[in-house]
Interface confidence: low
């Protein structure tokens, strides 16, 4: 057959779906690879073809669209499973073609088992809620397109394994789950089970997400440099190791990039000739406030190095701060015999 633009295996879209539940999978060609949509392609006389390779096999096979109860079907650019089976796991390819044009992409589909408490190897999306911030909601994700707006599904919410009923500060409201005042104790996995009828059958959609309660923007402050500070003087003799920690606290800020860096005499360490190393460590509080420590180290400090200016800088979306370390050369202790001799007028 003629050449086909092959976009390969799109591992960025590792699709995971639950066993024995409906799944609708859009052909990624129109979402990520081509500059036109399915309707345009269809109008231009292009045909969308689906096939697959089973797990641990190399052989490409056509998808069987003649299964009982139309278990697998195609509708426009969507491949439907009603429902999935465990052995549907594999690499799926959608190919758009006519006599003169061909483009295709493959993507992995993994059918995942869940247990009676919704535990599974499924990668869970994380939803961050601000601590003590007023009413916040999470919405049951990825359920659009499974049933028409005329169908009214039933939605049940769970925290971990337990149905959410009479919880103090968590209220199910259909597709939404409202947190009146989010607290650390609300951290955990939340599952919505959407049940809807279709052609005399009942289907369930299970969606689990992780809620992480984080610091509120109301409490956010610019970076705070705990070290260096005015109380600590780094007093060294030439030849000793100089170690200066820069420890900075950052409030949690959604999508903020926290940065810490040193300057020596106004230059970045990389831009000067002295042998300096910098090691960084990061720790987080339960609400994802961050403490970054960068330790500046000069193995054998010279008297020149002890005259330089060492400044720690920090920046977040809330602002930028800097603090100089107090570095000085240790005054040598008096050499007793010489001073004593001088004291007695020895020459």
């Amino acid at each position: 057959s003629e050449r086909c633009d092959d976009w390969g295996l799109d591992t960025m879209r590792q699709i995971q779906v639950f066993e024995d539940e409906p799944a609708r999978i859009k052909c990624p060609l129109f979402e990520h690879f081509l500059k036109f949509n399915y309707s345009t392609a269809h109008s231009a006389g292009l045909t969308l073809i689906w096939y697959w390779t089973r797990q641990d096999r190399d052989l490409e096979e056509p998808i069987n669209f003649r299964l009982p109860e139309n278990r697998i079907s195609k509708e426009k650019d969507v491949l439907w499973f009603r429902p999935t089976l465990l052995n549907d796991t594999g690499n799926y390819t959608c190919m758009l073609r006519n006599t003169t044009y061909c483009s295709k992409v493959a993507f992995p589909l993994e059918v995942v088992q869940k247990d009676s408490c919704f535990n599974s190897p499924m990668k869970l999306p994380v939803h961050k809620l601000y601590i003590e911030y007023g009413i916040q909601r999470i919405t049951c994700p990825n359920v659009d397109g499974y049933f028409p707006s005329s169908v009214k599904p039933t939605i049940t919410w769970y925290m971990g394994c337990y149905k959410i009923q009479n919880f103090n500060n968590v209220i199910p409201e259909g597709m939404n789950l409202s947190f009146l005042i989010a607290l650390i104790s609300n951290n955990g996995n939340y599952t919505c089970v959407v049940t809807y009828p279709e052609n005399g059958r009942t289907f369930h959609l299970t969606r689990t997400l992780t809620v992480k309660v984080v610091g509120s923007p109301k409490n956010a402050v610019p970076p705070v440099i705990h070290s260096p500070n005015d109380h600590v003087v780094y007093e060294k003799e030439p030849g000793e190791e100089l170690l200066i920690p820069c420890t900075v606290y950052f409030s949690f800020l959604m999508d903020s990039r926290n940065e810490v860096w040193w300057t020596i005499d106004g230059k970045k360490p990389d831009d000067i000739t002295i042998d300096v190393t910098i090691n960084e460590s990061i720790s987080h509080s339960r609400t994802e406030d961050e403490t970054r420590t960068q330790i500046l180290s000069i193995k054998k400090v010279t008297s020149e190095d002890l005259k330089r200016s060492y400044v720690c800088h920090a920046r977040s979306a809330k602002g930028e701060v800097a603090k100089a370390a107090k570095v000085k050369q240790k005054v040598p202790a008096p050499r007793y015999t010489v001073e004593l001799a001088c004291g007695f007028g020895a020459t």
């Epitope: 088992q113 408490c117 535990n119 190897p121 971990g160 394994c161 337990y162 955990g188 996995n189």
Partner: antibody, heavy 122, light 113 residues
Framework: EVQLEESGGDLVQPGGSLRLSCAAS?????????MCWVRQAPGKGLEWVSC?????????YYATWAKGRFTISRDNSKNTLYLQMNSLRAEDTAVYFC?????????????WGQGTLVTVSS | DIVMTQSPSSLSASVGDRVTITCQAS????????LSWYQQKPGQAPKLLIY???TLASGVPSRFSGSGSGTDFTLTISSLQPEDFATYYC?????????????FGGGTKVVIK
Amino acid sequence: EVQLEESGGDLVQPGGSLRLSCAASGISFSSSDFMCWVRQAPGKGLEWVSCIYAGSSVSIYYATWAKGRFTISRDNSKNTLYLQMNSLRAEDTAVYFCARSTGSVGRGFNLWGQGTLVTVSS
Amino acid sequence: DIVMTQSPSSLSASVGDRVTITCQASQSVYNSNHLSWYQQKPGQAPKLLIYSASTLASGVPSRFSGSGSGTDFTLTISSLQPEDFATYYCQGEFSCVSADCIAFGGGTKVVIK
């Protein structure tokens, strides 16, 4: 060799407490492991006590009778499962097994320890 | 409470016999097939034989088989061997949302006739 080894079983008076440990060797707890405690009273059958899903601290389950008295926990860095037993009664006398269910999805307990004996008696 | 009823509680059989043990749950196991079977010998830990109602665990001889769905399950030993004399337990997994997650049957002791 892959194995689970329980320890901490002892003779304890009614009302007392005991902490059982289960150390895994040859494997690390993975996020899809269901780690559980099962007990067996002398001459009796198996009885489920509690499970913890290693992937999520939310997922902790107890038999109805164990709620409030027993606490399951784990330390993944030490590859160890624990069972804290408080307010012990004579009927808690049993061999306590720890068991692992890989995948936690109806796969059964494919790995068991040899058990540790807890005797509750005055 | 969930009850798993195993029958018979004990049975006498000879080497070469076909042995059938049944297990009935007071409510459907999760996914209709979350049922396992174990063999236990005196002084030893249980050993997994069958999971998901009918799947043979690794290293288990093919003379063992399981069947059933929902609430009623069967373990069959097609031709009893000397090493098969032991106690057998069924174990169901249930929805933890509404009940205890896991329950064991009372056991069936298979003894030499």
